[in-house]
Interface confidence: low
């Protein structure tokens, strides 16, 4: 029997029943419950929360809820030897030391086990030397320093402001530039919005607030000691020297009060332009070293953190499908936090909890989804997406054969302005259709759809009358599902107005001040934005699990493939002479995209017309849709990044958070004019065009009539 026959409820009614069951008040209650103490990965507190969630998901009505544990490499500060940075004079005396902890927020003064700010996986070390200010430590910032300003970072300690790109990329860039240490700091230009007070009186970062975070360059590997395989009881572990992605130089984060003390003494070169100046009352001189009277003073880092193999726990809940139990729709978000996790991750975990409760309520009334829904509470996301990656490595054979879709559920909010969605093009129409059915929570849009407010506030930069939907990058738990396994993925959250708020992320990100009160007082007092995000995430899961024909539109992939081909071609065309010299042609790629477009169009026509009452044909058509994302996977992976296997999308090599299209070609073309061997470099461009063209053509053929 189909799930609808079993309950005699129409699909539309089911969706409405599911959405109506979601309550803002419950999300608020769950958020409060999840944020009263820290839940750092690998700690007893986070294990206890895993068991609590397991118990509650069972009560909510899931068929089964299991803990899946792994022993992975984590990183912690040394409790007896705190990390700090000092300014030392010529005698080696410490004349200034940075703070050892953040001043606790009101009401949390007596909470124990607040981990002090640190850069996870920093090696130990006590380097000392002159300081060089490197702006955001992006690739282009080091180009500016080394190529234009002729400043050598070799043997220097660099200080970089947080923002714009993933912190791990900053550290990698500093290492490549020869630096011997990295200081990361939050500049008010990026983490203090004008006209807003600092916490606890507003949502801005106080001077003593510091952003924690890992500084790995894992490129999708998961546990650094067991790349490609689960960190289970019989795992073979690499030695620390062979571990994947660990930084080789000490790194430490500080707040802007401490940064002021380091930056105010800077001498050497003036900043190259205004884009290198933040908002502190300092000259933003690049260095190297301190100015005039202070030129004999140096900076010294004292880093004593340790890397330890530690047990982590995922919670995996199952709601078995009535018709296609061997097809999995996954909703997953992490549970571990740096401290209280008021936004990251618990604003997401609370939403997942309410979605599980709503699905459970329907199940108790006799309903089942058509396909199986898996719910996941991931551990150790903050340490490199470890929980989700290890679970996916352990279950990769099942997932690649049965995985329909993965919906991510980290922070539900990073602002309260409008919706933000990143997803596979296969989900564009699903997201558009769903948001047209949901009410906007925004002021001034009463009675209007979410689609309307979203489109108005965040228009597509390319297409009129459409909202912006971004490419998936990384930095969150969808990575292994999308970039490695090729499972259609998406994420949604409420975000800020990027036009008026130029700061990076939200100001209190990964600080001790990310509390329940931050959300309840300043971001979403009525929890209406949380509810909307629950409706979007939950609605997507519902449709993916319950629609008879999978709600994927392959024609949208055709459109973006053409756009991405145009884009990469225009990048290449900045080198017309070399393209001529080395006979570089994009004809094969454009031809493949054209074929894909035609085949996708014909497939969509067949999808309208086929006999949906024939279960074999229905399954066949759905399998073609499910496996389309899989068809973009290259088993050999991208050059030097074997776990990034998607040929159309990968995290940018310069910023893990950002998605890049045709990444193989893009990376081959990047800075190609500086390559020593142009013939070899352009040969690699040609090879990458070949790989991309083949992959697009092969993917197109999966949509052809099967016989």
């Amino acid at each position: 029997k189909s799930s609808n026959e079993a309950t005699n409820i129409t699909p539309k009614h089911n969706m409405k029943a599911f959405l109506d069951e979601l309550k803002a008040e419950n999300i608020k209650k769950f958020l409060y419950n999840f944020t009263q103490i820290p839940h750092l990965a690998g700690t007893e507190q986070n294990f206890q929360l895993a068991k609590q969630i397991q118990s509650q998901w069972k009560e909510f009505g899931l068929d089964s809820v299991e803990l899946a544990h792994y022993d992975v490499l984590l990183s912690y500060p040394n409790k007896t030897h705190p990390n700090y940075i000092s300014i030392i004079n010529e005698d080696g005396n410490e004349i200034f030391n940075t703070s050892l902890f953040e001043p606790p927020p009101p009401g949390y003064e007596n909470v124990s086990d607040i981990v002090p700010p640190f850069s996870a996986f920093s090696p130990q070390g006590m380097p000392e030397g002159d300081l060089v200010y490197v702006n955001y430590a992006r690739t282009e910032d080091f180009f500016k320093l080394e190529r234009d300003m002729k400043i050598n970072c070799s043997g220097k300690i660099v200080i970089a402001r947080y923002g714009k790109v993933f912190r791990g990329n900053k550290v990698k860039n500093a290492q490549l530039a020869g630096a011997k240490g990295v200081i990361l700091y939050s500049d008010p230009a990026d983490y203090f919005a004008p006209g807003v007070k600092s916490y606890p009186d507003g949502w801005n970062l106080p001077g003593g607030g510091v952003q924690r975070g890992n500084i790995l360059n894992l490129n999708g590997a998961g546990d650094p000691l067991t790349p490609g395989y689960p960190a289970n009881e019989y795992a073979y572990r690499r030695g620390i020297a062979e571990a994947v992605g660990l930084p080789s130089i000490p790194v430490h984060p500080i707040g802007y009060y401490d940064a002021q003390k380091l930056l105010e003494k800077m001498g050497g070169s003036a900043p190259p332009d205004s884009s290198w100046r933040g908002s502190l009352k300092v000259p933003y001189n690049v260095g190297p070293g301190f100015t005039g009277n202070f030129s004999t003073q140096k900076v010294k880092m004292h880093i004593h953190s340790t890397n330890e193999v530690t047990r982590i726990y995922n919670v995996i809940g199952t709601l078995r499908g009535a018709v296609e139990p061997d097809r999995y729709v996954i909703l997953g978000g992490h549970r571990d936090s740096w401290v209280f996790g008021g936004i990251d991750p618990q604003s997401g975990a609370a939403v997942v909890h309410e979605i599980v409760r709503s699905f459970g309520t329907l199940k108790k009334e006799g309903w089942r989804p058509r396909r199986t829904i898996l719910f996941a509470s991931w551990d150790a996301e903050e340490f490199g997406l470890l929980g989700s990656t290890e679970w996916a490595e352990e279950n990769s054979r099942l997932l690649q054969e049965r995985g329909v879709a993965y919906i991510n559920a980290d922070s539900s909010i990073e602002g309260n302005y409008t919706l933000r969605v990143d997803c596979t093009p296969l989900m564009y129409s699903l997201v558009h259709n769903l948001t047209k059915e949901l009410k906007s929570p925004d002021e001034g849009f009463e009675g209007k759809s979410l689609y309307e407010s979203w489109t108005k506030k965040s228009p597509s930069p390319e297409f009129s009358g459409m909202p912006r939907i971004s490419k998936l990058g990384s930095g969150n738990d969808f990575e292994v599902f999308f970039q490695r396994l090729g499972i259609a993925s998406g994420r949604a959250r409420y975000t800020k107005n990027w036009e008026t708020n130029k700061f990076s992320g939200y100001p209190l990100y990964h600080s001790v001040y990310e509390t329940y009160e931050l959300v309840e007082k300043f971001y979403d007092p009525m929890f209406k934005y949380h509810l909307t995000v629950a409706q979007v995430r939950g609605g997507m899961v519902f449709e993916l699990a319950n629609s008879i024909v999978l709600p994927f539109d392959c024609r949208d992939y055709a459109v973006v493939l053409r756009k991405y081909a145009d884009k990469i071609y225009s990048i290449s065309m900045k080198h017309p002479q070399e393209m001529k010299t080395y006979s570089v042609s994009f004809d094969s790629l454009f031809s493949a995209v054209k074929n894909f477009t035609e085949i996708a169009s014909k497939f969509s026509e067949r999808l309208q017309d086929f006999d949906k009452s024939n279960p074999i044909v229905l399954r066949m058509m759905n399998d073609q849709l499910m496996f389309l994302e899989r068809a973009f996977i290259d088993p050999l992976g991208l050059p030097d990044r074997p776990f990034y296997r998607h040929v159309i999308y990968a995290p940018s090599s310069h910023n893990k958070y950002a998605g890049e299209s045709f990444p193989g070609i893009y990376d081959a073309l990047f800075d190609i004019e500086s390559k020593v061997d142009p013939s070899k470099a352009w040969g690699e461009v040609k090879r990458q065009i070949y790989v991309a063209a083949f992959t697009v053509q092969a993917a197109a053929e999966t949509l052809s009539e099967v016989a």
């Epitope: 297409f463 009129s464 024609r555 949208d556 459109v559 145009d566 054209k594 477009t597």
Partner: antibody, heavy 116, light 107 residues
Framework: EVKLEESGGGLVQPGGSMKLSCVAS????????MNWVRQSPEKGLEWVAE??????????HYAESVKGRVIISRDDSKSSVYLQMNNLRAEDTGIYYC???????WGQGTTLTVSS | NIVMTQFPKSMSISVGERVTLTCKAS??????VSWYQQKPEQSPKMLIY???NRFTGVPDRFTGSGSATDFILTISSVQTEDLVDYYC?????????FGGGTKLEMK
């Protein structure tokens, strides 16, 4: 109310130059990409050029038929967009409209005639 | 360049009639098609964007549909003021291109 007002059209000889202007009001001009579109009985509606906003580095795009002869520019402080046309040809004759991003709002047009 | 072909070039119709205008793209443009109405001595006005979304202030007798290469503008019950020129245009890729237009005339 969104308003776009073009000016600067007129009669010009082949090989001559002309600068068209468009003043915008009723919206935050600096946030929007702007286009010039022309219309003639022979060619119908024809997109000419686009200039993007500061956040897009004022990127410009041109139709092949005008590339190298036309420059689109903008002055956000004056809420104005311009079309400098050089080496004019008879086929450039038509009504020139200034349009807001996606051609969702159009001005009333200014007529350019290229004839000896 | 993507060619947008409109047909018929002109149509004679009576007030109250339902009318369907067609626009065909030479290659897939997704749903990035707009429809414009142009009255004599006036500039074009947007009617439909994103193939099927009615622009602000446009009467609901105007409906757009289609995707990929085939697009339709339907006027459910033609009024006298609707007997003017209609153009489709694509904003999927450069250069942006327009159809040659369809002229609605009184029967």
């Amino acid at each position: 109310e969104v308003k776009l007002e073009e000016s600067g059209g007129g009669l010009v000889q082949p090989g001559g130059s002309m600068k068209l202007s468009c003043v915008a009001s009723g919206f935050t001009f600096s946030n929007y990409w702007m286009n010039w579109v022309r219309q003639s009985p022979e060619k119908g509606l024809e997109w000419v050029a686009e200039i993007r906003s500061q956040s897009n580095n004022f990127a410009t795009h041109y139709a092949e038929s005008v590339k190298g002869r036309v420059i689109i520019s903008r002055d956000d402080s004056k809420s104005s967009v311009y079309l400098q046309m050089n080496n004019l040809r008879a086929e450039d004759t038509g009504i020139y409209y200034c349009t807001r991003r996606w051609n969702n709002f159009w001005g009333q047009g200014t007529t350019l005639t290229v004839s000896s | 360049n993507i060619v947008m072909t409109q047909f018929p070039k002109s149509m004679s119709i009576s007030v109250g009639e339902r009318v369907t205008l067609t626009c065909k793209a030479s290659e897939n443009v997704g749903t990035y098609v707009s429809w414009y109405q142009q009255k004599p001595e006036q500039s074009p006005k947007m009617l439909i964007y994103g193939a099927s979304n009615r622009f602000t202030g446009v009467p609901d007798r105007f409906t757009g549909s289609g995707s990929a290469t085939d697009f339709i503008l339907t006027i459910s019950s033609v009024q006298t003021e609707d007997l003017v020129d209609y153009y489709c245009g694509q904003s999927y890729t450069f250069p942006y291109t327009f159809g040659g237009g369809t002229k609605l005339e009184m029967k």
